[in-house]
């Protein structure tokens, strides 16, 4: 339930992350990809009713009513039609919230990799951030929790899990001998490799940090042609939003 | 209040089959891996079986492997230990734990059901 | 697998006495290391978790230590109450694994 040998980020230093509450509780994490679209991962909403669910943006400590968070409701939700809810295969869905995030220095968005781009190779420098507990027993972080990972050579991680992976699964390794990695309300938060989201936080084992059984993402890359359709079909929209700038080929 | 009840243990012949289960209440399963630990009389604890509900990813021990199966009921907040071709060294009482994830510690335990295997 | 290795595997104390039980695990754990009580006829109970850190509700008398292969419970007073076996565990790696126990009897 939370980032394991991370650190705090100074505050609002990664205005894309989003928080998902369901019963004023964090449940899980995510990524503003545009002004009104958020990217978390399918499994977060499970057995969930989306009218209780929130979306807090612009947040650094989330106990805090700080005056730069934005709270929207979820107005649809988009699984991806191949999720499986035992494997975590294709375990990606895109939020469409209730009003558009008014973007500054503490909400910000986060670029998925290109249409054409390739996962991150094995040794890559990443982080992964989330607000999920920095404690066994339910204490909440001071306020946004990262730390840094390495990307795992696929073979390597899909023999630790036994050959359970898919290859649009990603994963991570400690670049040292320190555990580092997420744990489960960090879900949905996004795995940040040269600025760009490459990954969503996905599973881990019987608990998190285990060498055996190392991190497994969601490989965005593998996802940018549907998350750009869902966006397309739901926002028919003239132009990019205010501050945001539209990547070649890509609909707004 | 956090609360773990296993049930199912009995007396049993050797190459037979049980099921047991760890009904738990006062939390839910997506924030805890569960896992079954036993201990046979006068001896110390072992570690047997575990599951992440949230993935149903499991692992045994390898004294175990490949006769006990171990499975969990989200909706129901109840996990199970499907046990056969027991044998005479599986008689033991067992317990099951939530194991919180982030530091892999068991913080709540079940009373425990004996097994008892024997002819 | 890691394997833990406790000592002594029993004990005699008095009332007040200051107790050290040992844990050493067969390779480097880091700090993942618990401590867990257990009286006969009931389920074990977390005391220590991240071989340092002392469960909610457990008494102040009761401290962990040590990172690494090498880690110490310390009773600094012992209480008529605390007459049980103590395990340690470990919980770097699957599977996670336990001593073989040490029984604290009243001298």
């Known amino acids: 339930a939370q980032i394991i040998g991370g650190h705090e980020v100074t505050p609002h230093s990664r205005p894309y992350m989003a928080s998902v509450r369901f019963g004023g509780q964090h449940h899980c994490g995510g990524f503003l990809l545009r002004a009104r679209w958020v990217v978390s991962a399918a499994h977060c909403f499970s057995h969930r009713d989306l009218r209780t669910g929130l979306v807090v943006l612009g947040a650094h400590v989330l106990s805090t009513a700080e005056p730069t968070q934005q709270v929207f409701g979820i107005d649809a939700l988009t699984t991806h039609p191949d999720y499986h809810p035992m494997t975590h295969a294709n375990d990606i869905c895109l939020l469409r919230l209730n009003g558009s995030a008014v973007l500054g220095p503490a909400v910000g968005l986060l670029r998925p990799p290109g249409r054409r781009a390739r996962p991150p190779t094995a040794g890559t420098r990443c982080r992964v951030a989330g607000w999920g507990f920095v404690s066994d027993f339910e204490e909440l972080p001071p306020g946004l929790m990262e730390a840094k990972v390495r990307v795992l050579d696929p073979d390597v991680c899909n023999s630790s899990w036994k050959g359970h992976l898919t290859l649009t699964m990603l994963c991570t390794r400690s670049g040292d001998s320190h555990r580092r990695g997420f744990c489960s309300a960090d879900s949905g938060g996004p795995l940040v490799c040269r600025n760009r989201a490459h990954g969503l936080v996905s599973f881990s084992g019987l608990w998190c940090g285990d060498p055996k059984t190392p991190d497994v993402y969601t490989q965005v890359s593998a996802f940018v042609a549907w998350i750009w359709d869902v966006v397309r079909r739901s926002s028919p929209q003239p132009g990019p939003l205010p501050g945001t700038t539209r990547p070649p080929g890509e609909a707004a | 209040e956090v609360q773990l009840v296993e049930s199912g243990g009995g007396l049993v012949q050797p190459g037979g089959s049980l099921r047991l289960s760890c009904a738990a209440s006062g939390f839910t399963f997506s924030g805890y891996s569960i896992h079954w630990v036993r201990q046979a009389p006068g001896k110390g604890l072992e570690w047997v079986a575990g599951i992440s509900p949230t993935n149903g990813y499991t692992d045994y021990a390898d004294s175990v492997k490949g006769r006990f199966t171990i499975s969990a009921d989200t909706s129901k907040n109840t996990a199970y230990l499907q046990m056969n071709s027991l044998r005479a060294e599986d008689t033991a009482v067992y317990y099951c734990?939530?194991?919180?994830?982030?530091?892999?510690?068991?913080?709540?335990w079940g009373q425990g059901t004996l097994v008892t295997v024997s002819s | 697998d890691i394997q833990m290795t406790q000592s002594p595997s029993s004990l005699s104390a008095s009332v007040g006495d200051r107790v050290t039980i040992t844990c050493r695990a067969s390779?480097?754990?880091?700090?993942?290391v618990a401590w867990y009580q257990q009286k006969p006829g009931k389920a074990p109970k977390l005391l220590i978790y991240s071989a340092s850190f002392l469960y909610s509700g457990v008494p102040s008398r009761f401290s962990g230590s040590g990172s690494g292969t090498d880690f110490t419970l310390t009773i600094s007073s012992l209480q008529p109450e605390d007459f049980a076996t103590y395990y340690c565990?470990?919980?770097?790696?699957?599977?996670?694994?336990f001593g073989q126990g040490t029984k604290v009897e009243i001298k």
């Open positions: 565990q470990q919980s770097y790696t699957t599977p996670p694994t």
């Open positions: 390779q480097d754990v880091s700090t993942a």
């Open positions: 734990a939530r194991l919180v994830f982030y530091r892999g510690v068991m913080d709540y």
